[in-house]
Amino acid sequence: ETDEESEEPGRRGSFVEMVDNLRGKSGQGYYVEMTVGSPPQTLNILVDTGSSNFAVGAAPHPFLHRYYQRQLSSTYRDLRKGVYVPYTQGKWEGELGTDLVSIPHGPNVTVRANIAAITESDKFFINGSNWEGILGLAYAEIARPDDSLEPFFDSLVKQTHIPNIFSLQLCGAGFPLNQTEALASVGGSMIIGGIDHSLYTGSLWYTPIRREWYYEVIIVRVEINGQDLKMDCKEYNYDKSIVDSGTTNLRLPKKVFEAAVKSIKAASSTEKFPDGFWLGEQLVCWQAGTTPWNIFPVISLYLMGEVTNQSFRITILPQQYLRPVEDVATSQDDCYKFAVSQSSTGTVMGAVIMEGFYVVFDRARKRIGFAVSACHVHDEFRTAAVEGPFVTADMEDCGYNIPQTDESTLMT
């Protein structure tokens, strides 16, 4: 069921002021401009659907051009509580407080929100990325230090009349790249409070949010150029499958990754590609404008539908899963890295997937919608697709039930 016309009140079809409010650099995430404090301090904030803290640089750091200066804000309130967030590689820590927050190219509202003022970090900020903080848009369950810290979007919905929904259109770089910068500029839109029909083509297809922590979904089938990987569908969701705008790659569980790469190799003339390419370490290049997209297969993920025994599929092109890498030495080459990688924490549908689609995070109805993005990079022969319905039985069995552990042992 596409549910195209049954929009709730407040879901206008056009959000002109929010269109094109995201910027970024290929592989370094998408950011939105936000203001914090009184008088307002402007910061660029990474949009991350894979975490739930609003955290901003609040101390000098070599990679930050600017940072949140709490002492200059008359509306800052200290919560007298620390927060520490370790990642597999790197970490950040800081002090919790609240302040007034708004999004200049967003809804015309100001809300009081929790803010983690980052005072110390390691391998978190990216040199030249142009963002100074992170906006975690997932649910309170994964907020740090615990689920009592209300995430920004919850505060926004609670304090205003904005509907409990947002949508993301991430527009990948493609070529030609901006020759004056080391990495290609990217753009996109974060629509807060609804759906903008100008940002997608065709129909929106919805998949249930399995559990409100990450934006967890269930993948029921995977195909490479129409060839089923034929794995137990539990493997696709081991130990979860999430939609995460803060991750660059499509990340797949080890077994699934190995099967997918084997299938991609078999479906394409890539016998001579260096092994390091498939590990995402080495690039491959072609003379500018001659990338043989046709030799690479499409990747299709089938997602659980809203109706029993019904699924739909989203299909991405090599234009999404080969990430353009600007080589500063020469502009005569189009170079790429393989942006599908291995994961030990389940499937992560990162920018590689999201750049093909307009993605609707319909929190009110506990579902995520996918439609073909009006800005996705494609060629004259193939396009990204969202298609359905397909009959798929026993989809509930595809979900993996994570054994309950002490949450403090979890790594982000």
Partner: antibody, heavy 119, light 107 residues
């Protein structure tokens, strides 16, 4: 501008050794393969072997396997062809050529360097 | 090894003529075939790749066709600068091999 410049050719006695160099510029060295192709006087083209500078993997024609070794120095954007146990039939102009990993063709070539094996 | 047999080994033609060179592989190579042009004392130049794709900068009078074992290079209207030797090359999963060459001379 893409450029491949071979050097190191010359006269060598049968059983001797020679190392040819191929200096590359104007493209992303790590993003392509480098092939060696030879052409005996008045004859056709014969593929000798190739290297992926990024991964170091190599392949060789049966006629040179065990005698020739291809290597690359990525810091210098240079590929090498080490030729040992040379025979009279190895006399040829040796070309290095750039090739994408797929399709496996040679899209830019050097000017060639002549290797003469004679006593 | 896969053998590539070119025919004819040489041909004489006039400016404006349509010229066809064929290449036969000793086994199925799908469309993994390229064509090169070489002039005396010069390095070869890529003309066609993947059997029928014209390489960038190559004049449209050159075209390629074929799949499996039989391949053709066609020059629709021979120009003075086209007098040269032409080589086919196969490049499937195996090691690449070249045809013996076809010399196109002025009649």
């Amino acid at each position: 501008e893409v450029q491949l410049v071979e050097s190191g050719g010359g006269l060598v006695q049968p059983g001797g050794s020679l190392r040819l160099s191929c200096a590359a510029s104007g493209f992303t060295f790590l993003g392509y393969g480098i092939h060696w192709v030879r052409q005996a006087p008045g004859k056709g083209l014969e593929w000798v072997g190739w290297i992926s500078p990024a991964g170091g993997s190599t392949d060789y024609a049966d006629s040179v396997k065990g005698r020739f070794t291809i290597s690359a120095d990525t810091s210098k954007n240079t590929a090498y062809l080490q030729m040992n146990s040379l025979r009279a039939e190895d006399t040829a102009v040796y070309y290095c050529a750039r090739g994408p990993f797929s399709p496996w063709v040679m899209d830019y070539w050097g000017q060639g360097t002549l290797v003469t094996v004679s006593s | 090894d896969i053998q590539m047999t070119q025919s004819p080994s040489s041909l004489s033609a006039s400016v404006g003529d349509r010229v066809t060179i064929t290449c036969r592989a000793s086994q199925d190579v799908s469309t993994a075939v390229a064509w090169y042009q070489q002039k005396p004392g010069k390095a070869p130049k890529l003309l066609i790749y993947s059997a029928s794709f014209l390489y960038s900068g190559v004049p449209s009078r050159f075209s390629g066709s074929g799949s499996g074992t039989d391949f053709t290079l066609t020059i629709s209207s021979l120009q003075p600068e086209d007098f040269a030797t032409y080589y086919c090359q196969q490049f499937p999963t195996y090691l690449p091999t070249f045809g013996q060459g076809t010399k196109v001379e002025i009649k």
